[in-house]
Interface confidence: low
Amino acid sequence: LSTSKTIDMELVKRKRIEAIRGQILSKLRLASPPSQGEVPPGPLPEAVLALYNSTRDRVAGESAEPEPEPEADYYAKEVTRVLMVETHNEIYDKFKQSTHSIYMFFNTSELREAVPEPVLLSRAELRLLRLKLKVEQHVELYQKYSNNSWRYLSNRLLAPSDSPEWLSFDVTGVVRQWLSRGGEIEGFRLSAHCSCDSRDNTLQVDINGFTTGRRGDLATIHGMNRPFLLLMATPLERAQHLQSSRHRRALDTNYCFSSTEKNCCVRQLYIDFRKDLGWKWIHEPKGYHANFCLGPCPYIWSLDTQYSKVLALYNQHNPGASAAPCCVPQALEPLPIVYYVGRKPKVEQLSNMIVRSCKCS
Amino acid sequence: LSTSKTIDMELVKRKRIEAIRGQILSKLRLASPPSQGEVPPGPLPEAVLALYNSTRDRVAGESAEPEPEPEADYYAKEVTRVLMVETHNEIYDKFKQSTHSIYMFFNTSELREAVPEPVLLSRAELRLLRLKLKVEQHVELYQKYSNNSWRYLSNRLLAPSDSPEWLSFDVTGVVRQWLSRGGEIEGFRLSAHCSCDSRDNTLQVDINGFTTGRRGDLATIHGMNRPFLLLMATPLERAQHLQSSRHRRALDTNYCFSSTEKNCCVRQLYIDFRKDLGWKWIHEPKGYHANFCLGPCPYIWSLDTQYSKVLALYNQHNPGASAAPCCVPQALEPLPIVYYVGRKPKVEQLSNMIVRSCKCS
């Protein structure tokens, strides 16, 4: 929005709220809100909440250093997770747990259940809970190619830490391959980094799920936190609508909320699903800070540009040298939601829902 | 721009051209075009053209996989390069060129001459010309810490190739460190990747500048293409204006130039510096395809949203659920230019000058 006229803030907010109503339905490819007649009583199942929280954590982690995201991600992604095959499975017997490596295997039938076709997969992350680490450790991740062949994927320098920490590796390409192939069990290897000169590195890092001798409740908790694949995929019924492009990213904000800036700025707008949209079908979250961009972006006639003060305004008001600059979102963040389809709770992530900053463009 | 009214295309173009006049001066922090009284006769020096071409190559390489760029990069960056110390220098005698590594050293006084203060450095790339490669090679880059200590930086999987190819490694952080420290010579090591199991890897890749026995003209050509650091930095005189944020990026285009789309689209606009701006002071290029965004982005009232056809329009016309969607640039590319300040030719890169695609936002 870019205008010098007096703005009816209420109308702008109402239009933004109404646009969000359509946007959410559109992203979920729903013509109308889903019926709530089949929803079971009581709170959301623990497993669903755990999944929702994993997704929220992923979002929080990314806002600090966001990944480029295909704009085919306009459409919501269904989020699922597949736990590592437990270490007492016979597959582990074939791979000696050496001093420099640990192995993690996954059942591809579970992966295919979650993502029926490779093209539907938007992102796959291998999540490992690393326990406290006394020394810095350089680790490498490999993909199983055949019984005795491993392909290097990526590496990570792990800083010493007194507290456990989730590690995340992007393994989208690998999981896409696995979904295309016929194998039953596929795996990764996490190894110490060895240079050609110093080859005696030991894997010092302790990954949750590999410590032996746990019993009872402790073993269950331990098992829940064992390595897993976090998958984000387009549901099959939305597959035909896929298209691709890319999305921009940036940083900013605090200034706008601590001033009454008249020019282009991000304006606070909290959407309460129940109060603002009359929706009870989204179970988590209860609402979110959608925000919006508002304020003029003055066009600067460069007839005045012999004055360096005027030139300095370009960066703020018209950095792209537009013929009619406009106040639009710069940094956007996704929103994970939980809702029911019939009796089945779903966790989905909606891209580009939260406006963090604006720019004149 | 977002309007349904009849548009005076000529006026829009004129406003875009005038805005670009101010934008370029603003990015260079010039109140008016620089005086050309000191410019020497004849063509640009070879070294300047080579630098300009390096910068252009960098741009071409990036549009395929653009790097996130701080928006302090709004202001132009001066581009310089520092060649690797030649291999006959005694520093190389201390490091045996083993079968799995090659070494590259740089004179930090040359770096400091190019970038007087670490904070001014925006980006540093290590550029290596790799010659043809028969097999796939996994290589690792290390930074020299002390005579016998090396710190891992990054790795690259090199595909087999019949033709030479420039490799680029982002070493911004390392060069910033070097600029902060007092050392005279600093270096990198390129090594074959060795896993803890298979340790007999040989560095198969042939990097230009390390082949011995060349003479005369061939040696000169070879020397020019030896490894170098490409540096982009804020000139000292513009340093006080530094501020930070982040910039967005995306992909798209061809459709708009081959259609008569009435809605939001990228529109062709070539700026000839001499004809359109009356400027003779930019030596390279003579002009550029600035382009601009134009066309309506209809607001979709979700009162109509019971119709799934209407919902499908959200992705195209109002993906961000704006109260007043606007046609703005999505993918922008930088523009390197060559101009003189007094007798001194400068190569500078101006960010976000070329509009490659537009979006409703």
Epitope: M9, F257, S258 | -
Partner: antibody, heavy 121, light 107 residues
């Protein structure tokens, strides 16, 4: 302890000038917009002026525009109100208030005790 | 400028009573409304912000509601320390404006 302490009030003749100060402590001063609010004897509250955290933006009530100037020195954690061309109707207790702008709602979550300004001949 | 009108201007009530004070804006201000309490000789104190959000440390007997032009402050069960003057304030646009105040007295 988080607190605001006003000073500089007193008796001044019509047409005269006065400079109020507000010393802030116990919080990151530069992170907050600040404001002056006044209250004439026996009357209600009246917003006077506000300033953004950096000092880059200032806002005034019509009744004081052109006569009063709000400013801040973040290095000294101090807010100021320079009052010129004072009138009898400016007589009031002047409160310094911290603005919590989270959400853009601009509410005054911390107040000083106030300083009395009396304009009289 | 946005005018804020409070009613009643004064009110007598007893300990334990439920009390409602209303505030009306001259134009829609969404939920950009705050409530303050002031006791004689003291500085005002924030009770409610954004129409319905309770400021931390404020007893839960205070609640705010409303949106647009009409707002209410409710004290569910009046306590002796609640006898004071109450002000509403809009932050929809500058100039920021306060209501004239409602003086709550002991009956």
């Amino acid at each position: 302890e988080v607190q605001l302490l006003e000073s500089g009030g007193g008796l001044v003749q019509p047409g005269g000038s006065l400079r109020l100060s507000c010393a802030a402590s116990g919080f990151t001063f530069s992170s907050y917009a600040m404001s002056w609010v006044r209250q004439a004897p026996g009357k209600g509250l009246e917003w006077v002026s506000a300033i953004s955290g950096s000092g880059g933006s200032t806002y005034y009530a019509d009744s004081v525009k052109g006569r009063f100037t709000i400013s801040r020195d973040n290095s000294k954690n101090t807010l100021y109100l320079q009052m010129n061309s004072l009138r009898a109707e400016d007589t009031a207790v002047y409160y310094c208030a911290r603005v919590d702008s989270s959400g853009g709602y601009w509410y005054f979550d911390l107040w000083g005790r106030g300083t009395l300004v009396t304009v009289s001949s | 400028d946005i005018q804020m009108t409070q009613s009643p201007s004064s009110l007598s009530a007893s300990v334990g009573d439920r009390v409602t004070i209303t505030c009306r804006a001259s134009q829609s201000i969404s939920s950009y409304l705050n409530w303050y309490q002031q006791k004689p000789g003291k500085a005002p104190k924030l009770l409610i912000y954004a129409a319905s959000s309770l400021q931390s440390g404020v007893p839960s007997r205070f609640s705010g509601s409303g949106s647009g032009t009409d707002f209410t402050l409710t004290i569910s069960s009046l306590q002796p320390e609640d006898f004071a003057t109450y002000y509403c304030q809009q932050s929809y646009s500058t100039p920021l404006t306060f209501g004239g105040g409602t003086k709550l007295e002991i009956k």
